[in-house]
Interface confidence: medium
């Protein structure tokens, strides 16, 4: 025997108390699948969150963060304060990266400079709070008789990642 509620489309709920008729979702709620017995309440993008997509009767609202903050967690469940490049966010706010570390983004933590010597290379460009060191060719490559020197690949521009 077919469940009469299976005929209730997205955007409605099947009302047990009214002979299982399909009732539209109440205001500020949605059902993204058919046959539901209740509608989910819409997410509200309040405070530091702002609405990226409005709630409809069949889909939830989507939030992102106001300028100066960035999303964290699945579905932008949290907004975290941005810092400047060369800084990291601590419990006490944005702090400059310690010597020997860098951060080339407005989010995340300061990471240690690359240790060029571990790869048998030399430091071509010193690191800063905002940039990692650039490793050059190994000292052996620079010795007389070495065939050719391949120039180092340019450092990736900060703030850009594959879309």
């Amino acid at each position: 025997l077919q469940d009469p509620c299976s005929n209730c489309p997205a955007g409605t709920f099947c009302d047990n108390n009214r002979n299982q008729i399909c009732s539209p979702c109440p205001p500020n709620s949605f059902s993204s699948a058919g046959g539901q017995r209740t509608c989910d309440i819409c997410r509200q993008c309040k405070g530091v969150f702002r609405t990226r997509k409005e709630c409809s009767s069949t889909s939830n609202a989507e939030c992102d963060c106001t300028p100066g903050f960035h999303c964290l967690g699945a579905g932008c469940s949290m907004c975290e304060q941005d810092c400047k490049q060369g800084q990291e966010l601590t419990k006490k706010g944005c702090k400059d990266c310690c010597f020997g570390t860098f951060n080339d983004q407005k989010r995340g933590i300061c990471r240690p400079w690359t240790n060029c010597s571990l790869d048998g290379k030399s430091v071509l460009v010193n690191g800063t709070k905002e940039r990692d060191v650039v490793c050059g060719p190994s000292p052996a490559d620079l010795s007389p008789g070495a065939s050719s020197v391949t120039p180092p690949a340019p450092a990736r521009e900060p703030g850009h990642s594959p879309q």
Epitope: N16, A33, T38, D40
Partner: antibody, heavy 117, light 107 residues
């Protein structure tokens, strides 16, 4: 037959965390919301939070930082976790099915949790 | 948060009486109000949803009314099994909140 049954530890030491399971039968968690409600001895009902058919949650603002509600649809179980318990968290904890325009049409019998050292 | 107030915490009535239990909200809740009955053993049942809709299986002697901030539950012909505590609950806005309850006793 629609049923909800809470199972909890009974006794919890202060500052410890509480985990309660609500096992449901006769319906699917993908179609109904489940709310948690508690009642301290001799006091009224207090709504703790809800988990929606799609898995989203909402919480009582006073307890939000200590509460977490999750579920396993395939096992027909909903879980309440509360951290940093104090003696005033001693209560009977109920799970209830939310349907229609968000009324609780079926309730579990409740499980009593005592916070004491 | 919306505060729900049941001013009468306990009420004594005789069998056959018509009993009214009131509930008020700290702001308008647009009829988004439910009523629950809790028996002395702790069992909780839904009586009325959306102010005045009778839940299936609930005797017709129970009825609900109200609008704006003021709501009431009426039991038209009190029976022994109605001895219980009655709670109103709003779902106009999250977090959902209950009234403090009204305990009904027999004279």
């Amino acid at each position: 037959q629609v049923q909800l049954k809470e199972s909890g530890p009974g006794l919890v030491a202060p500052s410890q965390s509480l985990s309660i399971t609500c096992t449901v039968s006769g319906f699917s968690l993908t179609s109904y919301a489940i709310s948690w409600v508690r009642q301290p001895p001799g006091k009224g009902l207090e709504w703790l939070g809800v988990i929606w058919p799609g898995g989203g949650t909402n919480y009582n603002s006073a307890l939000k930082s200590r509460l977490s509600i999750s579920k396993d649809n395939s096992k027909s179980q909903v879980f309440l976790k509360m951290n940093s318990l104090q003696t005033d968290d001693t209560a009977r904890y109920y799970c209830a099915r939310g349907t229609g325009t968000w009324y609780f049409d079926v309730w579990g019998a409740g499980t009593t949790v005592t916070v004491s050292s | 948060d919306i505060q729900m107030t049941q001013t009468t915490s306990s009420l004594s009535a005789s069998l056959g009486d018509r009993v009214t239990i009131s509930c008020s909200a700290s702001q308008g809740i647009s009829n988004y109000l439910n009523w629950y009955q809790q028996k002395p053993d702790g069992t909780v049942k839904l009586l009325i949803y959306y102010t005045s809709s009778l839940h299936s299986g609930v005797p017709s002697r129970f009825s609900g009314s109200g609008s704006g901030t003021d709501y009431s539950l009426t039991i038209s012909n009190l029976e022994p099994e109605d001895i219980a505590t009655y709670y109103c609950q709003q779902y106009s806005d999250l977090p959902w909140t209950f009234g403090g309850g009204t305990k009904l006793e027999i004279k």
